[in-house]
Structures are given as structure tokens and as C-alpha cells.
């Protein structure tokens, strides 16, 4: 037996992190996002659950809704009507999938100081929202959309086709929620509250994924979800718009699909209201390299929505799929005709373009070997966006302003020099016309949220600076974090290395690679985190490395699209390349290298362990994908095409984890999965296990009964991380 090696941080009054610290969330941080209700006013839920109103200009603040009112219905969330007369209170939150949940809603009348009693809302509701003006309510109940002109009025039923697991109105089905919309809703009010647009998803022909939910009963329940796997029948989508002023006179009007899209299988990807009678729809071919943006206008005379061909804008990728993870959405100018949009330039970097008439005549307004990430707000004279331009670090985010008024266009970085060491990764939240905005900095130092003047960019006040967290971390030995790049051939790979306290280059340390590596993801980010891997470095003396290989985002399409139609090849190759480079650095114990990942990361870690290189002693895969045929159509096909003989079946087959079962013989493999995973089905791990058994390869496994893709219930999470810690310490011969 090899002697166990115990890592002891040297004489220091500071203590190392413990696993308990991580599991208890002792070192979690806070952010502050104002809930804007006007150009200079916002709401915020206080620590003690009062809903507080703030006016930036008058410095006025008062409780608009007390915690006792919240508590009276066990409310955990709220929403103020635009006319400020009512608040909906949300309680009985019941999670469904990643974004979706059902809840009970109560309407509180702020004028009377009491709950609205007449025509109470049914329960549970799938989605509810106020109109942008006044206090109309739209909600989805049992897959149908209802409308209330006022909270106390009887509801008007807009759709009648809704049926569980068959037809969804105003809410997405599973695959659209997870892979296309990334929301729990599929309805959008026009800016003046006159029209309501919504999507109908017909899942009648979609195959069902069924799995057992064990619960506490004598018999398990079966969960059935229409879930199109790669190559399967997809949802049929239709978009409708209803006039909410006279919903009974004229029914919902269908918005036509562009001809070039309707000719084969297609997806709806997003809807953006441009003005009160103009709407912009985005569509995508099933083979996701062609996207069409269609601008439609209301024709009063026909009582219909018209989408002229000359208002169709095509975006096409010749090297991969359209867009990043999703196709970007347009940010329209005040003229309701021209818009700004992020898409790839001729060098393959995603940049902001200004489209006035045709995409061909688009004016590129950002350029360089970096990428524009998101357009936050377009006003009369400014455009605010985020990018990773500053100092050439792809894992940073700064906020920029481009002046677009009556002077030469100029670009200014709003955040680059604010708190340069502490803050290198920002997002922002703007008031309606950007008179004020909040900046939320996620690190690499302690997160901080600040309020700013939209004209001058001056900081007005600190909203949250995580003082308590700063104090509680004073006596903690945190590891050192480095973000650097390594070169191999013509490729550059950014990596983040987490080094144990008192790290000594002349010593040898075990190495754990944490990998995700999915297309258009990014792991090497300049953000603050105290999590499991922080603990492993701090307490157990393990060096942790995260590497962004080919297929990851924000470094141009050449790097991103390298994995197109061949998932599982370069992502793995690049992790292996990085490990070899880390060994060359001289402080890694070659005999003690491990890899772990979750979801796509579980797929990559499994393939890396089965690479036959002998680099890894052990590894963990949590909820891994094992074959792209088992995963959702929208995701798998975006990157892999179709699993058909005349398309890409061959690579679907040879990129499975099962195909490499034999290669697990010389590694210690821990396979973990939740049995109620609606996303990456337990089937994936069941098939890996079956292949390993068939190959007579020993491995370790753990399932989590009734846990989904996040394995997030308190007890399960504690068990999971404790179990993985034991496995790793055993692998690295670290004593308990």
C-alpha cells in the first residue's frame, strides 16, 4: 500500500474551508437587481421580506407591501401592476422543469389594503403576468390562456385547445422550455397592452419518455413527458395574436410562417414586440443553420397580421449552427424599423450589426478578435452592450456604451476601470430608457452591486457589497486563482487554476480537472466562487484546473464550430492536451490526476477517462449524456445534425460512451445519476453501466432516487458531495 499523503496548510491562524462550509452555503454571496417600475423608481424585497419602493431622484423610500401581508398568504414573490393599483402575490411554488413551476396567486388591492375577493384565480396557475399598461391579467391554467380586464372581473378564456402533455398554449413544452426559449412562458403583451401574442405547441405526435417516481407509496408513479430525442417527431408550433380589447369579437389571429421556413420542419425561436401594431418573430429550420427574422404588421382592414417578404431577414451559418447557444434577438430602434443584432462577422466573431433595410447592407458597429455578448438597451442616443474585449480575456464581461446620437459614433467602456481588481465580470439592469442602471459585478473579487446615472455613468450608491461575507472570509484560507492561457500548435486554450494555500511550485500536487465543455459554454470566467472545488484546494491540497477547449464560446466561430457534427472528439482532445501541459509545469503528481464533470461534463469526463492515454487515475461522471441519440432533438441536432444514414448517424454511433466501455478497465470510474432526471434521462447512465458490465469492467456507481438533473435536494446534495469527496481522497491516497 502506498502511504497516505495528508495536505496540511502551514502555520497560519486562518482555517481551511470545510466540506460542511460548502454544503451549508456559509459563503454564499448576494446580488441586488432593482425591480424597475419607471425611469427612476424601483422595488426591492428586503431581507425581512418587505417590498420597498425607492425613488432615486427624491431619495424617497417606503414599504409598498408589508411582510405581514406577504406572510398572510405565505407569498415568496410578487408583481406590481403597471398602474400601481394591484400586486399579485405568489405562493405554493411547485417546481416543474428548469424554468417552469406552478403556483397559487392572490391579488392584493393597494388602494383598499385588502385582497381582491371576486372571481379568485384558479389554482395551480402555470404562468401569470400583468399587461404592460394598466392592470389586465393574462394567465395560463391547465394549458389554456385566460384574460382578466381587471383583477376583480370574470376571466375570459382565450384558448380551448389546451390538454395535458398534448397541447400547450402560452407555455412551452419540455423541449422548447429547455432548449429554445429558456423561459416558463410563451406569451407576450404588445407594449400598449392591446394585443397578446402566444404560441401553441402541439405535442400529440411526440414520443413519450416515461420514468418511475418512487415517492412513498406502495407503487411508484410513472412520469410521462413528451420529449423528442434526436431525429424524433418534434412539436408543431403556431403563433397567434389576440386583441385583448375585444377578445370575444375576433378570435386569435395566426401569424404566417415565412415560406422558406415552412417548407420543412422548423422551430419558432422568439417573439419581440416592436411597437403596438408591429411584431417581430424569429424562426429556425430544423437543421439549425438558417434563421429567419420576420417583421409583421397589423392590417386593420383585413383584421390580420401581414409579414411581407421584404421584411424577412435571413441569417445563415456556413460553418456551423446559427447564433451562439441561441439565435440572438433584435434590439429595435425608436423608428420601429431598424434594429441591432449580434451575429457573426466575416471573420467569424459575434458582433453587433445595425440593420436598416437588409442583412446584406448591415453596418457592423463592433469589430475585433473578441465577441459582443449581449445588447442591454438601445435608447435615442446610446446603445449599451457587454463584451469580452477588455485586455483580451474571453472570460471577462464589461459593459460598454456606444453613442449613437448627433455626434460621431463613439465607444466607451463604462466598467473597465471602476474596480479593476475586484470586478472584471459584470452584468447590468437598466431602467426603461436607461436614465439609471444597476451594475452587478460577479468577481473575481467579492460581488458588488451599484447604482449609476445613465447620462454620466457616475456611481450613485452601493446597493450590496457583501460586507458580512467579507468578514466571514477573513479567517479562511482561500486558494489562489489564476486565469492564464496555454498554446498548443496553432490553438490557444484559456484555463483557470485553483492552487492550494501556500502552494509551492517545487512540490507535487494531485490534480483534478473539472470539465463541462459543451458547445457555446464557458468555464473559465473571472467570477467569485466558494464551492466544492474551492474546498478541495483549500483543505485537501488538490490543484484544480478548468480548461475551455474547442467548442466553447466567445472566442470566434473557428473555435466554436470546430466541434460541429463531431461532438466528443475535440472537447476531450483539448482536455488531454491541457493535462499534458500541466504536467510539464512540474508541480503535478502524474500518478494522481482525476477528472470530473456533470451533464455534458459527465460525457466529456467519461470519454477522457476512456481515452486510453493513461493520464487519469480516476474520475467521476454525474448525470452524463452517453449517446446523443438519447438527448433532446433541438440540442443534439443543432450540433450533430440528424441520426440518419444519409446525415450523421455514423458519428452519433461512434461518439457514445458505451462504444468505449473496454477502455475503462484501467481507471477508477464513479458513475452518478438521479433516477428522476427529466433532462438527461437515467437511461444514459443505465446504458453506460450495461456496457461496462457486458465488458466485465469494474466501476462504482451511485443513484439518487427521485432526484432530477440537479440532484439538489438538501440531503441528496450532501450525500453526493460527501460521496465524491471520499472517492477522490481514496483515489489520491489522502487520509480522512
Amino acid at each position: 500500500l502506498r502511504p497516505s499523503r495528508v495536505y496540511k496548510p502551514e502555520g497560519n491562524t486562518k482555517r481551511a474551508l470545510t466540506l460542511k462550509d460548502i454544503l451549508n452555503g456559509t459563503f454564499s454571496y448576494k446580488t441586488y437587481f432593482p425591480n424597475w417600475i419607471s425611469e427612476q423608481e424601483y422595488l426591492h424585497q428586503s431581507e425581512d421580506d418587505n417590498i420597498v419602493f425607492y425613488n432615486i431622484e427624491t431619495r424617497e423610500s417606503y414599504i409598498i407591501l408589508s411582510n405581514s401581508t406577504m406572510k398572510s398568504v405565505n407569498a415568496t414573490d410578487y408583481g406590481l401592476s403597471p398602474d400601481r393599483q394591484f400586486v399579485y402575490l405568489e405562493s405554493d411554488y411547485s417546481k416543474l422543469w428548469r424554468y417552469s413551476y406552478t403556483a397559487t396567486y392572490y391579488i392584493y388591492d393597494l388602494q383598499n389594503g385588502e385582497f381582491v375577493r371576486g372571481y379568485e384565480l384558479p389554482r395551480p396557475i402555470q404562468y401569470l403576468c400583468w399587461s404592460p399598461v394598466g392592470s389586465k391579467l393574462a394567465y395560463v391554467y391547465q394549458n389554456n390562456i385566460y384574460l382578466k380586464q381587471r383583477p376583480g372581473d370574470p376571466p375570459f378564456q382565450i384558448t380551448y385547445t389546451g390538454r395535458e402533455n398534448r397541447i400547450f398554449n402560452g407555455i412551452p413544452d419540455w423541449v422548447y422550455e429547455e432548449e429554445m426559449l429558456a423561459t416558463k412562458y410563451a406569451l407576450w403583451w404588445s407594449p400598449d397592452g392591446k394585443f397578446l401574442a402566444y404560441v401553441e405547441f402541439n405535442d400529440s405526435d411526440i414520443p413519450i419518455i416515461a420514468y418511475s417516481y418512487y415517492g412513498d407509496g406502495q407503487y411508484p408513479r410513472t412520469i410521462n413527458i413528451p420529449y423528442p430525442k434526436a431525429g424524433a417527431k418534434n412539436p408543431v408550433v403556431r403563433v397567434f395574436i389576440v386583441d385583448t380589447t375585444y377578445p370575444h369579437h375576433v378570435g386569435p389571429m395566426e401569424v404566417p410562417v415565412p415560406e422558406m421556413i415552412a417548407s420543412s420542419d422548423y422551430y419558432f425561436s422568439w417573439l419581440t414586440w416592436v411597437s403596438s401594431e408591429r411584431v417581430c418573430l424569429q424562426w429556425l429550420k430544423r437543421v439549425q443553420n438558417v434563421s429567419v427574422l420576420s417583421i409583421c404588421d397589423f392590417r386593420e382592414d383585413w383584421h390580420a397580421w401581414e409579414c411581407p417578404k421584404n421584411q424577412e431577414h435571413v441569417e445563415e451559418s456556413r460553418t456551423g449552427w446559427a447564433g451562439g447557444f441561441f439565435v440572438s434577438t433584435p434590439a429595435f430602434s425608436q423608428d420601429a424599423t431598424s434594429y441591432y443584432k449580434i451575429f457573426s462577422d466575416k471573420d467569424g466573431y459575434k458582433h453587433i450589426h445595425y440593420i436598416k433595410d437588409t442583412v446584406e447592407n448591415a453596418i457592423q458597429i463592433t469589430s475585433g478578435k473578441w465577441e459582443a455578448i449581449y445588447i442591454f438597451r438601445v435608447t435615442q442616443d446610446s446603445l449599451f452592450y457587454s463584451s469580452n474585449e477588455f485586455e483580451g480575456y474571453p472570460g471577462r464581461r464589461n459593459i460598454y456604451r456606444i453613442s449613437i446620437g448627433n455626434s460621431p459614433p463613439s465607444k466607451k467602456c463604462v466598467t473597465c476601470h471602476l474596480r479593476k481588481e475586484r470586478c472584471q465580470y459584470y452584468t447590468a439592469s437598466f431602467s426603461y430608457k436607461a436614465k439609471y442602471y444597476a451594475l452587478v459585478c460577479y468577481g473575481p473579487g467579492l460581488p458588488i452591486s451599484t447604482l449609476h446615472d445613465g447620462r454620466t455613468d457616475q456611481e450613485i450608491q452601493v446597493l450590496e457589497e457583501n460586507k458580512e461575507l467579507e468578514n466571514s472570509l477573513r479567517n479562511i484560507q482561500l486558494p489562489k486563482v489564476e486565469i492564464k492561457k496555454l498554446k498548443d500548435g496553432g490553438l490557444t486554450f484559456w484555463y483557470k487554476m485553483i492552487l492550494p494555500p501556500q502552494f509551492d511550485r517545487s512540490k507535487k500536487y494531485p490534480l483534478l480537472i473539472q470539465v463541462y465543455g459543451g458547445p457555446c459554454s464557458q468555464s473559465v470566467k473571472s467570477v467569485f466562487a466558494v464551492n466544492w472545488i474551492t474546498y478541495l484546494a483549500s483543505k485537501e491540497g488538490i490543484v484544480i484546473a478548468l480548461v475551455d477547449g474547442r467548442g466553447t464560446a466567445f472566442q470566434g466561430d473557428k473555435f466554436l464550430h470546430a466541434v460541429y457534427r463531431k461532438l466528443g472528439v475535440y472537447e476531450v482532445e483539448d482536455q488531454l492536451t491541457a493535462v499534458r501541459k500541466f504536467i510539464e509545469m512540474g508541480f503535478i503528481d502524474e500518478e494522481r490526476i482525476a477528472i470530473w464533470g456533470w451533464s455534458y461534463g459527465g460525457y466529456v469526463s467519461s470519454l477522457a477517462l476512456a481515452s486510453g492515454t493513461g493520464l487519469f487515475k480516476c474520475g467521476i461522471a454525474v448525470a452524463p449524456v452517453s449517446s446523443w441519440e438519447y438527448y433532446a432533438s433541438i440540442y443534439s441536432e443543432r450540433f450533430m445534425g440528424l441520426p440518419t444514414k444519409d446525415d450523421n448517424l455514423e458519428h452519433y454511433k461512434n461518439s457514445t460512451v458505451m462504444a468505449r466501455a473496454e477502455y475503462f478497465r484501467n481507471v477508477d470510474y464513479l458513475l452518478i445519476h438521479g433516477t428522476a432526471d427529466d433532462n438527461v434521462h437515467f437511461q444514459n447512465s443505465a446504458q453506460i453501466a450495461k456496457a461496462l458490465v457486458n465488458a466485465q469492467v469494474d466501476f462504482q456507481a451511485m443513484w439518487y432516487s427521485d432526484q432530477n438533473h440537479g440532484i439538489s435536494s438538501g440531503r441528496s446534495q450532501n450525500h453526493l458531495y460527501t460521496h465524491m469527496t471520499h472517492f477522490l481522497k481514496q483515489c489520491f491516497s489522502l487520509s480522512d
Epitope: 436598416k356 453596418i363 455626434s407 460621431p408 463613439s410 465607444k411
Partner: antibody, heavy 121, light 107 residues
Amino acid sequence: QVQLQQPGAELVKPGASVKLSCKASGYTITSYSLHWVKQRPGQGLEWIGEINPANGDHNFSEKFEIKATLTVDSSSNTAFMQLSRLTSEDSAVYYCTRLDDSRFHWYFDVWGAGTTVTVSS
Amino acid sequence: QIVLTQSPALMSASPGEKVTMTCTASSSVSYMYWYQQKPRSSPKPWIFLTSNLASGVPARFSGRGSGTSFSLTISSMEAEDAATYYCQQWSGYPPITFGSGTKLEIK
């Protein structure tokens, strides 16, 4: 089509003044700002200044603030630049050019053929 | 004021050759603009907002850069591309400044 017409040449004596014209055709002069650019023989381009024909507002390069005067006669759709106290250093080709300041353009889209000014006794 | 330095001052290229000329600003600018001028002719707008080709400019031309470093590239030199190219910026406006020019000749 849109054009800016400038006389071909002006011969002036040192110490004198010259008034260069720039006649716009194909568009209304008050719709766009007009800039003047100097180019000495075999040399690069040097910005002199600009005038907004709609309101007469102007900006100059510091170097030309005393040297140049910019005016517009909207009735004849013509812009003028007067150069005073001329020296041999002022011998150059002078271009008038229109600024396309539509959103995100901001470039000089139409140029006159240039007037060659020769300062010689 | 912002000074623009163009390099090289003079260069020659054979037909089909890739050509790159640079423009360096003395301090950071938001965007760069380029003009082409042929002998005895007025300048013509060539590239605006760093990377956009003006109307009628062949697709073999491209513009790149940010901060203080900008470039104009011709992917495959043609005889008609022989000219002097000037960069120009608005960031210190007023004044507007031009670079001293790069004269491109055909071999």
C-alpha cells in the same frame, strides 16, 4: 446625381485673401454639414474645419482658426471658405466634402474635385 | 489631438498578393475610417466604422482593429488597388485627424 463643384485653380499673391467656392448640386446644401480639407503637394490630408449650413455653426482645427472663414449661401446652394494672409505654406489643393452623418456612417461621402491654390508673387 | 501613424509609408505588391497596412493612434479611438486616393483625384470613402466597406468597394478589402491599432487588408491585390490610403478618426473631434497615408504600388 450628388456633386460638389469647385473651381480648378486660384493664383493669389502673398498676404492677400482668397474665397473658395463649393457648389452643391443634387441635394439641398442645408441637409448635410460641409468640411474643408487641405492637401499640400505630395502630402497627406489635413482637416481645416466644418460648417453646418443649416445654422452656420462651425468648428475649426486650432491651426486654421485665424486663417479660415466658413460661410454658406443657401439660396445658391454654395459654401465658401475664405483664406486670409496667404503665404507659400498655404499653397495646396483645397477640397470641400460632404459628411454623411446618417446613423453609423459619419464619413465624407462626396468630395469636390479640389481647388488648387497657388500663392506666388 | 490624436495623431495617426500609418505604416509603411510606401509599399508594393504583386497581383494576387495579400496586403496589410496599419494605422496606429496615439491614444485609444472608437472607430477608424479609411479613404482611397489616386493621383490627380479626390479621396474616396473606402472603409467606415473600422470594418464596413463603403458603397462600391470590392469585397477583397477588409478593415480591422480596436483601441490604438487598426489595419486595412486586401486579400488579393489587383492593379486597380494601387493608390494612397489614408486613415481618419473622429474620437478627438474636433479636430478630425488623418494619417499621413500609405502609398500602395503594383509590382
